[in-house]
């Protein structure tokens, strides 16, 4: 097993909102949930956009997945990892 | 360390509105988190009921959210319950509690304060 | 409304025993699970969060897993100070919901 790097991060999208990406690579096996959470539970299916999960050519696996978010409300979101039994959760950078 | 106490009135007449201060120490309510009023009745149901947010946003129970309201005083550090048009059926032990936007459990509860509805 | 239906309602074990208490949603709440522990006239105390991730201090004998809409907290040899009230919530989507809870007794 080979646990993800994530890394999020921000890029300015329409007046007023950004788009926060979260990017998990060099992973193995690729089985992986990665979500956004708002509030503290699951962001809704519809406002997340994922990525495939691709192999990155060194027998691991990389993915991503983005929402667009209000500025200012970075607080309230968080990036969800989870891989063969590990979690982790990974806030929007300043 | 993050510390919660409630604090009100133990007695509420029914029609009246029920009233309780939430008091945190160890942490600015601004800084981050949800604060939230979870409650439980008699019969050990556990009920949750709304938070407010590090910024002042409120999110309720949609069971509750034509009486309950929820609001802060930040020069005290406090948030508090308000609860209108109460009944018998509003008796219970009302806690304070708060989560991180990492998920929402609470990892922390204050030690409850019991509110009985009664004529 | 998610609703989360906890069994049994109430079991007697004795120290040392091996108990399971089991947890179902009515939807897929991918995980996002919580349980607790109340002893009588406390306030809840968390054991367990993302399912099965076991809180800060929790003793190794907790255990937990699930996934979709069924879930379960195990207690390996029963402690005199696990004795009490066992809930799950469900942190999928607003509003929170718990469990009706299990209390556990000395038998």
């Known amino acids: 097993t080979v646990p993800p790097m994530v890394n999020v991060t921000r890029s300015e999208a329409s007046e007023g909102n950004i788009t926060v990406t979260c990017r998990a690579s060099s992973f193995y096996p690729r089985n992986i949930i990665l979500t956004w959470r708002q509030d503290g539970v699951s962001l809704s299916h519809d406002a997340q956009q994922w990525g495939d999960v691709l192999p990155d050519g060194n027998g691991t696996y990389q993915t991503w997945v983005a929402t667009r978010i209000c500025r200012g409300e970075e607080q309230r979101f968080t990036c969800y990892m989870e891989h063969s039994g590990n979690h982790s959760t990974h806030p929007v950078p300043s | 360390d993050v510390q919660l106490q409630e604090s009100g009135p133990g007695l509420v007449k029914p029609s009246q509105s029920l009233s309780l201060t939430c008091t945190v120490t160890?942490?600015?309510?601004?800084?981050?988190?949800?604060w939230n009023w979870i409650r439980q009745f008699p019969r050990n149901k556990l009920e949750w009921m709304g938070y407010i947010n590090y910024s002042g946003t409120t999110n309720y129970n949609p069971s509750l959210k034509s009486r309950i309201s929820i609001t802060r005083d930040t020069s005290k550090n406090q948030f508090f319950l308000q609860l209108i048009s109460v009944t018998t059926e509003d008796t219970a032990t009302y806690y304070c509690s708060y989560y991180r936007y990492d998920g929402a459990w609470f990892p922390y509860w204050g030690q409850g304060t019991l509110v009985t509805v009664s004529a | 409304d998610i609703q989360m239906t906890q069994s049994p309602a109430s079991l007697s074990a004795s120290v040392g025993e091996t108990v399971t208490i089991t947890c179902r949603a009515s939807g897929n709440i991918h995980n996002y699970l919580a349980w607790y522990q109340q002893k009588q006239g406390k306030s809840p105390q968390l054991l367990v969060y993302?399912?099965?991730m076991l809180a800060d201090g929790v003793p190794s004998r907790f255990s937990a897993s699930g996934s979709g809409t069924q879930y379960s907290l195990k207690i390996n040899s029963l402690q005199p100070e696990d004795f009490g009230s066992y809930y799950c919530q469900h942190f999928w989507s607003f509003p929170l919901t718990f469990g009706a809870g299990t209390k556990v007794e000395i038998k």
């Open positions: 160890g942490y600015s309510i601004t800084s981050d988190y949800a």
């Open positions: 993302n399912a099965i």
